[in-house]
């Protein structure tokens, strides 16, 4: 006799990094026939949804219309078919961004380097934070954590053309509350035929799309649930 149903998948749209006062949708995908889904936040019930008709729906969306620091944290969901409940989903870390201040990102020796050169990024924020995050825009996961009183350094080591791309950093006030993003720094690494854009598998995005945080770490991964647990989510564990 099966005691529980398989765990559902959970993810955030458009992104797990949510600017304060913006809307985010938490998606929970279970099974067709599920009559109720529950979203839990930090261990307590946050919301309930009863899809109609349940036999034609296997995913629900929980809307958070106005993101703030009180709603940043760890979410999970469960679903019910008849009287049988599922295992809880993996944890989703929801991060609120655009809190307080904007860090400054710089790169040494400069934004244009030759393949093989040692490159270090510096993220500086003159407010009460000691953790910093460096993110590379694109589909793949390029997130580093650094520590420092007002500045953290992120040594990339000898770079290759794979390091080309646009970087931003955040100050982190806690695991789930991050600063505004820094201005972007585009790293150009010569030694490849094309050095003014990212490789096709790691595309750049127009600058204005950063505001919706569609472009770092999870884009292209959110829908591929098997990959959900790695990427930037692991930094928050």
């Amino acid at each position: 006799q099966q005691q529980t149903l398989p765990k559902p998948f959970i993810w955030a749209e458009p992104h797990f990094m949510v600017p304060k006062e913006k809307q985010v949708t938490i998606c929970c995908q279970g099974n067709y026939g599920a009559v109720e889904y529950q979203l839990h936040f930090e261990g307590s019930l946050f919301a309930v949804d009863r899809p109609k008709p349940p036999e034609r729906i296997n995913k629900v969306q929980f809307y958070i219309p106005d993101m703030n620091s009180r709603m940043a944290g760890q979410y999970s969901c469960i679903y019910r078919v008849g009287e049988l409940w599922s295992e809880p989903s993996n944890l989703l870390d929801l991060v609120v961004t655009e809190m307080y201040d904007t860090p400054t990102l710089s790169v040494h020796p400069g934004p244009e380097v030759i393949s093989g050169e040692k490159v270090t990024f510096y993220c500086r924020l003159d407010t009460a934070t000691s953790m910093f995050l460096l993110l590379k825009e694109g589909r793949s996961s390029h997130v580093q954590r650094g520590y420092g009183k007002v500045q953290a350094e992120f040594p990339l080591g000898p770079v290759t053309t794979a390091h080309r791309g646009t970087y931003r950093c955040f100050g982190s006030y806690n695991n789930h509350a991050w600063s505004f993003p820094s201005e972007p720094v585009k790293l150009l690494v010569t030694g490849d035929i094309e050095n003014t854009s990212l490789a096709p598998e790691d595309p750049t995005f127009p600058a204005d799309t950063w505001g919706t945080y569609l472009l770092t770490t999870e884009t292209g991964l959110q829908k591929d649930h098997a990959l959900w647990d790695h990427t930037a989510q692991n930094l928050l564990r």
């Epitope: 019930l45 946050f46 919301a47 309930v48 949804d49 969306q61 929980f62 219309p65 106005d66 009180r70």
Partner: nanobody, 127 residues
């Protein structure tokens, strides 16, 4: 934003009933998922009941299930809480709250999901 005004509170004997109302103005109530919360002196605000925006699905915690019923009349722009078999431990200030969600079916049980709040109405249950 929507403005919310609660009414219907008062003093009632244990075992009695009350019906709270929450009148909305400024925006149509059908744009909001709604909830009732309560706060007794010295205690945290506690979830009592919630109702989805369109589907009318409801949720209540075990402490009031079977005794309290939440309902809404979108045409009258009013939310209700029917409270039966009242107990002294139900004594509190009762607040209605609104969440501007696009979802027709989400039912919110967490106070931080609600952006608009009424001023509250006092309910006192004597033994």
């Amino acid at each position: 934003d929507v403005q919310l005004v609660e009414s219907g509170g008062g003093l009632v004997q244990a075992g009695g009933s009350l019906r709270l109302s929450c009148a909305a103005s400024g925006r149509t109530l059908s744009s909001y998922a709604m909830g009732w919360f309560r706060q007794a002196p010295g205690l945290e605000r506690e979830f009592v009941a919630a109702i989805s925006r369109i589907s009318g699905d409801t949720y209540s915690p075990d402490s009031v299930k079977g005794r309290f019923t939440i309902s809404r009349d979108n045409a009258k722009n009013t939310l209700y809480l029917q409270m039966n078999s009242l107990k002294p431990e139900d004594t509190a200030v009762y607040y209605c709250a609104a969440s501007a969600t696009p979802s027709a079916t989400n039912i919110y049980t967490n106070q931080y999901a609600y952006g608009d709040w009424g001023q509250g109405t006092q309910v006192t249950v004597s033994s």
